[in-house]
Interface confidence: medium
């Protein structure tokens, strides 16, 4: 596959991909890698993947852990391989921060979005065909 014209050189990293969003792939390419843990209906849901758009990752990665969601991000090929996100220990609070409730969000597969992974709401997911 060859790029048609001069364009931005996005400096992509190879990331480990694990979870529903990955389809049959075990890796993805993005400007940041992540490892996340969320509580869904009482279950621990671990995911790994990549943010293809830097701004999207920046926002999510700066979000401090909440009791229901933790995301750890890194930059470097396969840098999320040995990272396991951890929820904050009980009693630890993060004053003055606005937590995104990412446990209500999921990642659609890169394939479905034509090569771009995006965070979308649970509501949107109901109207989206999954493999």
């Amino acid at each position: 596959m060859e790029d048609e014209k001069p364009k931005v050189n996005p400096k992509l990293y190879m990331c480990v991909c694990e979870g529903l969003s990955c389809g049959n792939e075990d890796h993805c390419e993005g400007q940041q890698c992540f490892s996340s843990l969320s509580i869904n209906d009482g279950f621990h849901v671990y995911q790994k993947g990549c943010f293809q758009v830097y701004e999207q990752g920046k926002m999510t990665c700066k979000t401090p852990p909440s009791p229901g969601q933790a995301v750890e991000c890194c930059q470097g090929d396969w840098c999320n391989r040995n990272i396991t996100a951890q929820l904050p220990t009980k009693g630890k609070s993060f004053p003055g921060t606005q937590n995104f409730h990412l446990e209500e969000q999921k990642l659609i597969s890169e394939e479905d979005l034509g090569g771009e992974q995006k965070l979308i709401s649970e509501e949107d997911l109901h109207h989206h065909h999954h493999h």
Epitope: E2, K7, V8, N9, P10, K11, M14, V53, Y54, D77
Partner: antibody, heavy 122, light 112 residues
Framework: EVQLVESGGNLVQPGGSLRLSCAAS????????MSWVRQAPGKGLEWVSG????????YYSVSAKGRFTISRDNSKNTLFLQMNSLRAEDTAIYYC???????????????WGQGTLVTVSS | DIVMTQTPLSSPVTLGQPASISCRSS???????????LSWLHQRPGQPPRLLIY???NRFSGVPDRFSGSGAGTDFTLKISRVEAEDVGFYYC?????????FGGGTKVEIK
């Protein structure tokens, strides 16, 4: 120690073809993008083409597009540059360069091979 | 394509004295990730180039601290605090923010 050794440079007539090779050692070849950079005699540096570690994405300069094809054989740790429709202005030393990461181009060109000389002349 | 313009073309310097090379890009080099991908390379006569500085000011592994890079936007500078005999040769700036990657025309550093 990371090593890159280019070969395949030769004297070729205008309109002719040549295939350059770069044998890599000392690192996990498939984990890194690679590029070809050339330098005409007594002139500056010109980036020619790049390829991701898995070989899926390729990029070319305006002068190389349509005439040159970059490829790699990760099982043999070898990078290639197939050059067709060669012109006098393609005469240069061609360097093979290791990139910073799998899909990372420029910014961190290290190391460079010693280069192979391509001369296009009748 | 982004055009990289280096000045001066040639810089005769005295051993132990400072030297400065300028590089100007035809457009800003800030990438979508916020970083500026401007590198400096050094090429001694008869040798392949070697990387000195990446992302404007980061010295590459093994590069002496007499080399420093600075700048922002479209204007960048490489400084050698005290020139040594081994520093002769050509210096090139290079942008890798946009394809195709492009180099400056080079600056020749020679001893007076």
């Amino acid at each position: 120690e990371v090593q890159l050794v280019e070969s395949g440079g030769n004297l070729v007539q205008p309109g002719g073809s040549l295939r350059l090779s770069c044998a890599a050692s000392g690192f996990t070849f498939s984990n890194y993008a690679m590029s070809w950079v050339r330098q005409a005699p007594g002139k500056g540096l010109e980036w020619v083409s790049g390829i991701t570690g898995n070989g899926i994405k390729t990029y070319y300069s305006v002068s190389a597009k349509g005439r040159f094809t970059i490829s790699r054989d990760n099982s043999k740790n070898t990078l290639f540059l197939q050059m067709n429709s060669l012109r006098a202005e393609d005469t240069a030393i061609y360097y093979c360069v290791k990139e910073r990461g799998h899909s990372w181009f420029g910014d961190w060109f290290d190391p460079w091979g010693q280069g192979t000389l391509v001369t296009v002349s009748s | 394509d982004i055009v990289m313009t280096q000045t001066p073309l040639s810089s005769p310097v005295t051993l132990g004295q400072p030297a400065s090379i300028s590089c100007r890009s035809s457009q800003g080099l800030v990438n979508s990730d916020g970083n500026t991908y401007l590198s400096w390379l050094h090429q001694r006569p008869g040798q392949p180039p070697r990387l000195l500085i990446y992302e404007i000011s980061n010295r590459f592994s093994g590069v002496p601290d007499r080399f420093s890079g600075s700048g922002a936007g479209t204007d960048f500078t490489l400084k050698i605090s005290r020139v040594e005999a081994e520093d002769v040769g050509f210096y090139y700036c290079m942008q890798s923010t946009q394809f195709p990657l492009t180099f400056g025309g080079g600056t020749k550093v020679e001893i007076k």
